[in-house]
Interface confidence: low
Amino acid sequence: SPVPFGPEGRLEDKLHKPKATQTEVKPSVRFNLRTSKDPEHEGCYLSVGHSQPLEDCSFNMTAKTFFIIHGWTMSGIFENWLHKLVSALHTREKDANVVVVDWLPLAHQLYTDAVNNTRVVGHSIARMLDWLQEKDDFSLGNVHLIGYSLGAHVAGYAGNFVKGTVGRITGLDPAGPMFEGADIHKRLSPDDADFVDVLHTYTRSFGLSIGIQMPVGHIDIYPNGGDFQPGCGLNDVLGSIAYGTITEVVKCEHERAVHLFVDSLVNQDKPSFAFQCTDSNRFKKGICLSCRKNRCNSIGYNAKKMRNKRNSKMYLKTRAGMPFRVYHYQMKIHVFSYKNMGEIEPTFYVTLYGTNADSQTLPLEIVERIEQNATNTFLVYTEEDLGDLLKIQLTWEGASQSWYNLWKEFRSYLSQPRNPGRELNIRRIRVKSGETQRKLTFCTEDPENTSISPGRELWFRKCRDGWRMKNETSPTVELP
């Protein structure tokens, strides 16, 4: 579905009956068993109490069964993402049953009405599952509901209403408006399945959040902080409305959750890993790259089942397109002294040199400020696998890039006209790979030269001792 925006409203207990004045097709829910990867193929329609289609269409009672649940729809037809997901599931799980839940007539309405219909659609899915459970060999534990946008909450209702517990629900950017802060029985929640994993790709802390911001699963993964997705164009979505690009930007970021999931199905040799962290800012600082005590996990289909006492928020960076995997590094830089720093923060870049490849020049994002006589932690990530790291080039950018910084420099100069030059002293850089969990220490090439100043660079090589502390468990891929 495109985006869960439409007029609006809060989720209501009482289901609104579709208005008699609407001339659309009578509201219904249909279950289409996809018997082919071909989107044009008709598939088989399943209905409660009718066993013949199960036999005619070779429904495999002992195999995994996926239910794909779309969300609110503007066009009234299935969109491309759904065909891609069906195809990816067929490719990955050849014997599985892939069922598309078609609730288009109920979803192709004003958003408020579509939301009010989610409950009845959830009931329909639960009834189908209850009926299937009456068959020999069918196990609810083999059922995986995959819901996108409003469909994620439909999956929640289905999991809530079914007799027993479904194996897994994956929420792909569950809808935000009317669900944010809602009671657990009125939205997707960890109670709805044995394992509930969620990808959040379009959350906003300002204005309206199309995707739900709050954690709603056992694990909630926020790629790129859960907001601005690389490759989705304009950052200021609201500012772009006037230029007609809101559709593309919103669709790109909201739908990114689906493509990340598809990526996890078709590129299982390039799994993306997410790391548990209390918030996005801490993750950006590079603090959260641990895999100890289940603190990291594969994202998407390959996620390992984790049933935490409370929601686990996890973060990762991604590329702009498939395969989305990047390689995360924590960089700990101990600044043991600095001179004449003035008001402005330095702008640092690093280049990592490895046995397989060298990185591009990567900015070190200063989330707060550089601390003196303290270890400053940064997150950097590369799109390519560098292999084992050999050396690091640290560069302090010379000329200021912003008028604000230029102004601060000028003010600094006025107050200290004989500023003898800004300088920082760094002896070593500690690096930890998120993907391998290996830790290394890099020392300055020349132990006598540890200072760096604007426009200059410092080179670091692996120290002799290597600082290979206790290896933590690496995020091995456990295929479901």
């Epitope: 495109p2 985006v3 925006f5 439409g6 007029p7 609006e8 409203g9 809060r10 208005k19 004045t21 609407q22 001339t23 659309e24 503007m74 066009s75 009234g76 037809i77 192709h108 004003l110 958003y111 408020t112 408006p177 009317m178 309206l208 409305i241 007609g244 809101i246 559709t247 919103v250 669709k251």
Partner: antibody, heavy 119, light 106 residues
Framework: QVQLVQSGAEVKKPGASVKVSCKAS????????MHWVRQAPGQGLEWMGS????????SYNEKFKDRVTMTRDTSTSTVYMELSSLRSEDTAVYYC????????????WGQGTTVTVSS | EIVLTQSPGTLSLSPGERATLSCRAS?????MYWYQQKPGQAPRLLIY???NLAPGIPDRFSGSGSGTDFTLTISRLEPEDFAVYYC?????????FGGGTKVEIK
Amino acid sequence: QVQLVQSGAEVKKPGASVKVSCKASGYTFTEYTMHWVRQAPGQGLEWMGSINPYYGGTSYNEKFKDRVTMTRDTSTSTVYMELSSLRSEDTAVYYCARYGNYVGYFDYWGQGTTVTVSS
Amino acid sequence: EIVLTQSPGTLSLSPGERATLSCRASSSVHYMYWYQQKPGQAPRLLIYYTSNLAPGIPDRFSGSGSGTDFTLTISRLEPEDFAVYYCQQFTSSPYTFGGGTKVEIK
């Protein structure tokens, strides 16, 4: 640039019908619902109904449902609103308004078409 | 249908003054939308989802409220702000508008 251009003013006799057009440009016509809102002289705004250009699904205000018909022509990116059995109280300015489905409000409006019903 | 009642019907103020416009719904609505209309022109969206400023609208406009009571505030009236303001609900069909509040120069 998004534009909604409506047909010109109409003068009709009571009991007759009027068909107002609204031609859309500057965006993908089938991706946004079009609504019709009218405003009688010196009065407020009144929602009449909507049409989804993708497959022609309509939703009408109960007050008008026996007299209003909304259609669309995707080849020309135009929506039409026909009101039958006209009476003097139907004298108003009729606006088409694009409903921004990705943001949930009337984000662009036509310039309005004045329909006068007089014997 | 949900009836929206706007008050006052007319507000006479001078440029630079603060304007507070009220919209009351006959039953609870989820969000409120506000439009500005000048003579001979189509309405223009100001506020959506109760408190979100539409693109290109100056921040002297703000919206608030919940349930049945909603408010549009113009912190300092500019000459171009003198117009008629309508509230609207999308909670329940038919999607109704308020009767309007005319903000005129004192």
